[in-house]
């Protein structure tokens, strides 16, 4: 990656990592506006299956593991990465270690939420305070989740599918900040693993994943007025272990595995024609990235 | 009845490479992590490499990082192994097997590797 | 790495005995412990898996335990088919080691 300055844009998404044949430290960010890619500061070491949030203009690269020809170590690191300087740097890591993490931001706080330390599956959330740079366990979930999609919707935290070391897990189940404690929600119709999981429009969406058979290109969303699940348009790739963010009222699926191969194509759903396209190729495939959007 | 059936053994010179083939029946192998172990004439079991079928992430012994590849081609429900730089030490016995929560609960019949000058 | 130390390395029974075959490992590996038994010739079978569950058509006479770090294969009434030998392995963390094995013979 690059050490210079970053040109200063508006929003971009930012895609971090990822695996393919081991794990990376690319950190890249493409413009929807223009269709170009910048590619910027290299992660301090290579992780994939992280998760990657923004909070005060900051983006944060959390969790993972370094998978390399010389080891495989999970991460319980936290890292910055200011894009006016384009450098990262450190922040004090979480409790454990957890890879295939999801993260959600509520208040300016940073949910790490299960994820893997070897073979333990984690219930366990952890919640990060930026000003203070600590980060504090609270109510653990009802179930272990690994590869699970992460998303916050009315300051309420929702962890949707993965899992679990024995089943991969259509459930899902809801964090109350407030009573510090979690509920279960209405299960997807599909068992998703590694799915891509986002908010558009007062709805949660659930896109590709693993079922324990096959990568998925369903995609599913949320209701959380009436409670249910209601299958929208498939992505055009089956995808699994991808990295999803919304941008200017659309999502934006980037990377993953099929099965055969690690996708470098970019789709992008438009919530009013319900349909998918391509809009973009990621300078490499690769799975296990993590992805967010900049704030303006 | 599920069956792992391992090919492309025999004897190559050091420095030489093989391909080994696992098919796969009676299950899936996009639904399982698949896994080579290898067993040296006389000695015990040590695993090589292994493959995640959610993620196609794969992993590996030591021994053998930077010279052998793992993948699987779900179109023929076969996995592979792909040996280069081969070392005289890397004679054994090579099985594929499935995993199963902490074990692994299908085996191939093995294929014999032999790597000498 | 996670060294898997098995013991006896060997053992002779006789057929009735109650064999006990321990893995002690380096540091903690959970519940994360498989029991194989392999026969000349022939590739490992699966006995148990996650320390202490009997894996699908396996005798019961056949049993796994976990204190702490240690493991133990405890066969309750030896047949004359279970002559063989025995490996432990752990699947906690990355990479899976196999503890040495233990020979099983006929007294």
């Known amino acids: 990656g690059s050490m210079g300055h970053a040109p200063k844009v508006g929003r971009l998404i930012y895609t971090a990592g990822g695996y393919f044949r081991q794990s990376l430290s690319y950190l890249e960010a493409y413009n929807p506006s223009d269709g170009t890619w910048l590619d910027l500061a290299d992660l301090q070491v290579p992780r994939s299956g992280l998760a990657g949030c923004v909070v005060g203009g900051l983006l944060y690269a959390v969790g993972g593991r370094n998978n390399s020809p010389d080891g495989n170590t999970d991460s319980s690191a936290l890292d910055c990465y200011n894009p006016m300087t384009n450098q990262w740097s450190p922040c004090a890591p979480m409790s454990v270690p957890r890879n295939r993490i999801g993260v959600g931001v509520i208040d300016g706080h940073i949910y790490a939420v299960g994820g893997s330390h070897g073979c333990i599956h984690h219930n366990s959330v952890e919640r990060y305070e930026p000003e203070r740079d600590e980060w504090h366990l609270v109510a653990p979930m009802l179930t272990r989740r690994i590869g699970v999609g992460v998303a916050v919707l009315n300051r309420l935290l929702y962890a949707v599918g993965g899992f679990d070391g024995t089943n991969r897990l259509n459930s899902a189940e809801c964090y109350y900040p407030e009573r510090n404690e979690w509920r279960m929600i209405t299960a997807m119709n599909t068992i998703r693993s590694g799915a891509g999981v986002c908010v558009l429009h007062n709805c949660i969406y659930a896109a590709g994943g693993y079922d324990g058979q096959d990568q998925l290109n369903s995609v599913e969303r949320y209701d959380v007025e009436t409670e249910t699940w209601t299958f929208v348009a498939p992505m055009k790739h089956r995808r699994s272990a991808l990295g999803i963010t919304v941008h200017q009222g659309r999502i934006y699926v980037l990377g993953g595995y099929d099965g055969h191969t690690f996708l470098d194509s970019v789709e992008c759903y438009d919530p009013d024609t319900d349909t998918w396209s391509e809009v973009t190729r990621m300078t490499s495939g690769r799975s296990g990235v993590g992805v967010a959007v900049t704030m303006e | 009845e599920v069956q792992l059936v391992e090919s492309g053994g025999g004897l190559v010179q050091p420095g030489g490479s093989l391909r080994l083939s696992c098919a796969a029946s009676g299950f899936a192998i996009s639904a399982s992590s698949i896994h080579w172990v290898r067993q040296a004439p006389g000695k015990g079991l040590e695993w090589v490499a292994s493959i995640d079928p959610e993620t196609g992430e794969t992993l590996y012994a030591k021994s053998v990082a930077g010279r052998f590849t793992i993948s699987a081609d779900t179109s023929k429900n076969t996995a592979y192994l792909q040996m280069n730089s081969l070392r005289a030490e890397d004679t054994a016995v090579y099985y594929c097997?499935?995993?199963?929560?902490?074990?692994?609960?299908?085996w191939g019949q093995g294929t014999l590797v032999t790597v000498s000058s | 790495d996670i060294q898997m130390t098995q013991s006896p390395s060997s053992l002779s029974a006789s057929v009735g005995d109650r064999v006990t075959i321990t893995c002690r490992a380096s540091q903690s590996v959970s519940s994360a412990v498989a029991w194989y038994q392999q026969k000349p010739g022939k590739a490992p079978k699966l006995l148990i898996y996650s320390a202490s569950s009997l894996y699908s058509g396996v005798p019961s006479r056949f049993s796994g335990s976990r204190s702490g770090t240690d493991f133990t294969l405890t066969i309750s009434s030896l047949q004359p088919e279970d002559f063989a030998t025995y490996y432990c392995?752990?699947?906690?963390?990355?990479?899976?080691?196999f503890g040495q094995g233990t020979k099983v013979e006929i007294k």
């Open positions: 392995q752990q699947s906690y963390s990355f990479p899976s080691t």
């Open positions: 097997t499935r995993a199963h929560a902490y074990g692994l609960d299908y």
